[in-house]
Every structure is written in C-alpha cells, then in structure tokens.
Amino acid sequence: ARNGDRCPLGPGRCCRLHTVHASLEDLGWADWVLSPREVQVTMCIGACPSQFREANMHAQIKMNLHRLKPDTVPAPCCVPASYNPMVLIQKTDTGVSLQTYDDLLAKDCHCV
Amino acid sequence: ARNGDRCPLGPGRCCRLHTVHASLEDLGWADWVLSPREVQVTMCIGACPSQFREANMHAQIKMNLHRLKPDTVPAPCCVPASYNPMVLIQKTDTGVSLQTYDDLLAKDCHCV
C-alpha cells in the first residue's frame, strides 16, 4: 500500500523539517535586525522520491514526467507546506520596532 | 540595482514556466482519464540564483545559508507560485464525469 510518509531511501533521507542554527551574520541580517541574535531556522530538506509527501496532482505529474525525461524535467522538490510566524526586532527609519514575519520558518514540508 | 526577474545565468536558464507535451500514458493517467488524450503541462523549471524571484523571507534565508553551507542546505527550488485549473473527463465507479482540478497546471513560478 502506498505510504506517503515512509521514506524508501532510508530514515531521514527524504523531504522533512530540519533545524539549522544561524547567526544574524549568517542570515545577512546584521545590518537591520537587532534581536534575536541567533535563530533556529526550520527548513525543508531532503529527497522527493515517487509518492513521498506529494503536495498535489502537479507533483504527481512532475514525478511521472521526470521518470520519462529526467534531463528535461526535474524531480519534485522539498519545500514548506506551511510556515510558523516569528518576530524580529528591527531597525527602521523611524526607530526600533517589533515586526512579525509570517513566512520565515517552515512548519511542515511537502514535495512539489 | 537588484532585479528579481533578471537571470544572471543567461536567458531561459533561471526559474520560469515551461510547457511539456505529454500523453495520458506519459502521465500515468491512461487507466482513469478519457479526455484530453494529450496535455500541455505547464511546470516550473530552472535555477534559483540569489535574489531571483524569491518567494518570501524563507527563500532569502535558504539562499544565504546555502552559500554558507552548500553541503547541508540546498539552494531554493523553482516551484509553482499559483496554478491554473483544468478539467478532466474521468472514469468513475458510476460512469464518466467531468472533474475540475485546481492544482494541475502551474500558472507562474517562484523560488522557495
């Protein structure tokens, strides 16, 4: 039976949420963000084998065409299905303020 | 000046909409779709260099971390930003029906 969450490549090899520890300098934010000084960035990393966490019909099509024409059509890609919001304390023209960003941290992942 | 739509790799090399001509057999649909017999599949293909069609803040983060840790963090990926709906005439248990799919054909592309 098809199982969209069982990785045929082995544990942890397929599309899933990873956490990467990054400084403001790593992120290129040091000139406009004051806090936090470090971020636990959640992002989607891993392979997208056939039928694994397919986001939609388009992902199915893409996988089928990739198998037929691998040099023309790439395999589906592991990307965020949704995001967790996060606040940054940032410098602006008018001073320092708290800003909420809705699209900073991946919440869960799928293959598109 | 930054230009999110100018491809630094040369014309047509960066993330954009491509059309791939496919039969029902190519798509693996021959056993459940009656019409159309061929589909002009629009999909997103191409590289995602820095600042090119970045979908959101997450894409910027991913690119910055990819440059720092290319073996750990992949580059952003070219995926649909939106879809065009399409109707399929399909076989069902009770006969034939027309079904609209909202997520079959990519309408435009961005890097995530």
Epitope: L34, S35, P85, M86, V87, L88, V96, L98 | -
Partner: antibody
C-alpha cells in the same frame, strides 16, 4: 492595536497567595519570539523584573523570588498568569505585565495595585 | 545578578538644556541595555534599545550611548514634558535587572 490589562485582588493578608491575570489583545503568544513579562514597582521605588514566559512555554524567573513564583499562559484566551505564594508587606506594589518580542519590552499594561495588610 | 547603578537619584535642568543620565553595570553587558521613561502616574515607556537605538516614534532629542559597563542617556533641548523618571535595564543575562531610576526635575 496592542493592549495589556492586569487584574488582581487589590488587597491581601500576609501569607495568602496572589493571583494576577494579564489579558492582552492585538498579538498572539504563539508566534516565535513573543513573550510576556511581569514587573513590579513599590510606590515611589524602582522596577523589579519578576518572571517571563515565552511562546514555547519556556519560563524564566527572578532567582530572588523563584520559589514563590509561578508564571503560566492560556494562548487560546490571550491571558498570562502570575502566582506569588506567601505574600508579605514587602510585596505591596504596582504589578505590570509587559509584552516582549525576545527581550524588547514595547507595550506595558496600566498596572494593578496590590496592598498586603493585616 | 547584574547590578545596574544610577548614581544620581535626582537631576535638575531647565527647558532647552542638555542633560545626561548615567548608568553603570556591575559586569560587561555588551550593548544589551534599554532605557525607559516613566512620567508621574503612568506606566513606563521604552526610549532606547540595544544601548543606542531609539524606539520607533521617540523624539531624536533622546540619544543613548555606551557599551560594556557604562551607559548614558542624553536628552538635548529638554522639554517640559520630559519631566519623568528614567530607568536603565540590562537584558544581557537573567535575571533582567533595572537601575534604581533618575528623576528629572525641570527648574
């Protein structure tokens, strides 16, 4: 817009437990980096930070009062709570709840006054 | 705990003058210092974050400076509405601590 409002008993007797509620609106305590602190100020004196609760339920306390303090939250009802056990006259003060993004205090409540008296 | 010392409890100044409120940390806190203004009968309000950055909407006559252990809040062209108490605070490490406050009186 962002608002925070503290509520409490007003008057307590020594050795009783103080229960404070901070009701807020205009932001969510589910967002990464968001938090709420409790800070108190005896009349005519300085500010004392008591406790902080983060979006992920991480809690921080002032060590000088830690054994008496409990901070908690109810994100669905947009409330943060502080309990102080065994109050004494030294706990007489105005208690403020304050919104903080990470360590950036940007919105303060109007404060609620507690008097401890026998 | 890090002790924040505001040695001057009271300062007197005149409208139009320039005044500097100082704050000393008992150990290095980098630039992790904020300043707050509390007018009589009101809640405190943020003025300066990260030692030198004004909160959004704070007039530019308020300036913060310093790093390590010595910090200064300078008010240039003092206005009558600046009558208030000013507190420094460190957020470099827990417990977050405040200075004792400096009351600004307008002559």
């Amino acid at each position: 817009q962002v608002t925070l409002k503290e509520s409490g008993p007003g008057i307590l007797q020594p050795s009783q437990t103080l229960s404070l509620t901070c009701s807020f609106s205009g932001f969510s305590l589910t967002i990464s980096g968001m938090g709420v602190s409790w800070i108190r100020q005896p009349s005519g004196k300085g500010l004392e930070w008591l406790a902080h609760i983060y979006w992920d339920d991480d809690k921080r306390y002032n060590p000088s009062l830690k054994s008496r303090l409990t901070i908690s939250k109810d994100t669905s009802s947009n409330q943060v709570f502080l309990e102080i056990t065994s109050v004494d006259t030294a706990d007489t003060a105005t208690y403020y709840c304050v919104r903080a993004g990470w360590d950036f205090f940007d919105y303060w409540g109007q404060g609620t006054t507690l008097t401890v008296s026998s | 705990d890090i002790v924040m010392t505001q040695s001057q409890k009271f300062m007197s100044t005149s409208v139009g003058d320039r005044v500097s409120v100082t704050c000393k940390a008992s150990q290095n806190v980098g630039t992790n210092v904020a300043w707050y203004q509390q007018k009589p009968g009101q809640s405190p309000k943020g003025l300066i974050y990260s030692a030198s950055y004004r909160y959004s909407g704070v007039p530019d006559r308020f300036t913060g400076s310093g790093s390590g252990t010595d910090f200064t809040l300078t008010i240039s062209n003092v206005q009558s509405e600046d009558l208030a108490e000013y507190f420094c605070q460190q957020y470099n490490s827990y417990p977050w601590t405040f200075g004792g406050g400096t009351k600004l009186e307008i002559k």
